[in-house]
Interface confidence: low
């Protein structure tokens, strides 16, 4: 396929990536699926600079990112290494809290209202951010 050279309509370009910011809420899995259908993924935050960019656009609202520990260890949806990568958890987080009464712990990460991260119940209907890399080959057929 051809390389994507500019961001789709209604997406925001930043540092060779394109970002789409939802204005409605979905459970984490539905948000993840939404991004995949757009040939993208839930946002993967790899630096303080990217954190500030996303934070500026989402404002002080709970927003899903592409980080989860549903299978045990924390993992980024695009395969970025969690252990050695950028992290911005709130103090005492993640805590896999079980006291919410919804069953299970907390397996999905979101930006909190000050931008730092928290783990929460994946079923909560939070906003989300999709990201796709500009240099990634798109799924569209090449122009002949």
């Amino acid at each position: 396929g051809s390389e994507r050279t500019c961001c789709p309509v209604n997406w925001v370009e930043h540092e060779r990536s394109c970002y789409w910011f939802s204005r409605s809420g979905k459970a984490w899995a539905d948000a993840d699926n939404y991004c995949r259908l757009e040939d993208a993924h839930l946002v993967v935050v790899t630096s303080w600079e990217e954190q500030k960019f996303v934070q500026h656009h989402i404002g002080p609202v709970n927003t899903w990112m592409g980080l989860h520990d549903q299978n045990g260890p924390w993992k980024w949806v695009d395969g970025t290494d969690y252990e050695t990568g950028f992290k911005n958890w709130r103090p005492e987080q993640p805590d896999d809290w079980y006291g919410h009464g919804l069953g299970g712990g907390e397996d999905c990460a979101h930006f909190t209202d000050d931008g730092r991260w928290n783990d929460d119940v994946c079923q909560r209907p939070y906003r989300w951010v999709c990201e796709t890399e500009l240099d990634k080959a798109s799924q569209e057929p090449p122009l002949l």
Epitope: V61, N62, P91, T112, D113, D114, Y126
Partner: antibody, heavy 115, light 107 residues
């Protein structure tokens, strides 16, 4: 328009109790953490308590721990502060404020603890 | 707990003056600092969050900078409605703490 309206303040004797309410409108209440902040007469601002958007996480200032209880009802877009064992030093205007940024504030409700 | 200090505690200035207020945290708070303005008898108003981001509707004469432990709030050209008390606040960790305030009054 974002609005926060506190109520429930008043005059109470030392050792007494009060329940403050904060009615929120104009925003998605269940997406935001909420806070109580107070200001004693002629003094500065003092953070009292915070509660996360879902109510999962709760924090208190040492000065009120064990006496005050913060809670919220997302179905009613309301925040509460139950205050017990009130002391003269709790006399203040109590404000609710939105999010960890404290980006929006109510007008405040005065609490006077005096015999 | 993180202690917040402000200087000066008060200052007298004239309309049109450039005013700078400093805030210091007892330990590093990255950029988790906010500034508030309060006029007598009114609720505080949020001016700036994340150390330097102006809140919506705040005039551009207000600016702020800093990271770690040292922060500044600057009013480039003081207007009559700016005479008030200014507070900084850290939200890096609980308990959230405010500075003692800086009162800006008319010279």
């Amino acid at each position: 328009e974002v609005q926060l309206v506190e109520s429930g303040g008043g005059l109470v004797k030392p050792g007494g109790s009060l329940r403050l309410s904060c009615a929120a409108s104009g925003f998605t209440f269940n997406s935001y953490s909420m806070n109580w902040v107070r200001q004693a007469p002629g003094k500065g601002l003092e953070w009292v308590s915070s509660i996360s958007s879902s109510g999962s996480y709760i924090y208190y200032a040492d000065s009120v721990k064990g006496r005050f209880t913060i809670s919220r009802d997302n179905a009613k877009n309301s925040l509460y502060l139950q205050m017990h064992s009130l002391r003269a030093e709790d006399t203040a205007v109590y404000y609710c404020a939105r999010s960890n940024l404290f980006d929006c504030w109510g007008q405040g409700t005065p609490v006077t603890v005096s015999s | 707990d993180i202690q917040m200090t402000q200087s000066p505690s008060s200052l007298s200035a004239s309309v049109g003056d450039r005013v700078t207020i400093t805030c210091r945290a007892s330990q590093g708070i990255s950029n988790y600092l906010a500034w508030f303005q309060q006029t007598p008898g009114k609720a505080p108003k949020s001016l700036i969050s994340v150390a330097s981001s102006l809140q919506s509707g705040v005039p551009s004469r207000f600016s702020a900078s800093g990271s770690g432990t040292d922060f500044t709030l600057t009013i480039s050209s003081l207007q009559p409605e700016d005479f008030a008390t200014y507070y900084c606040r850290q939200y890096h960790s609980y308990p959230f703490t405010f500075g003692p305030g800086t009162k800006v009054d008319i010279k």
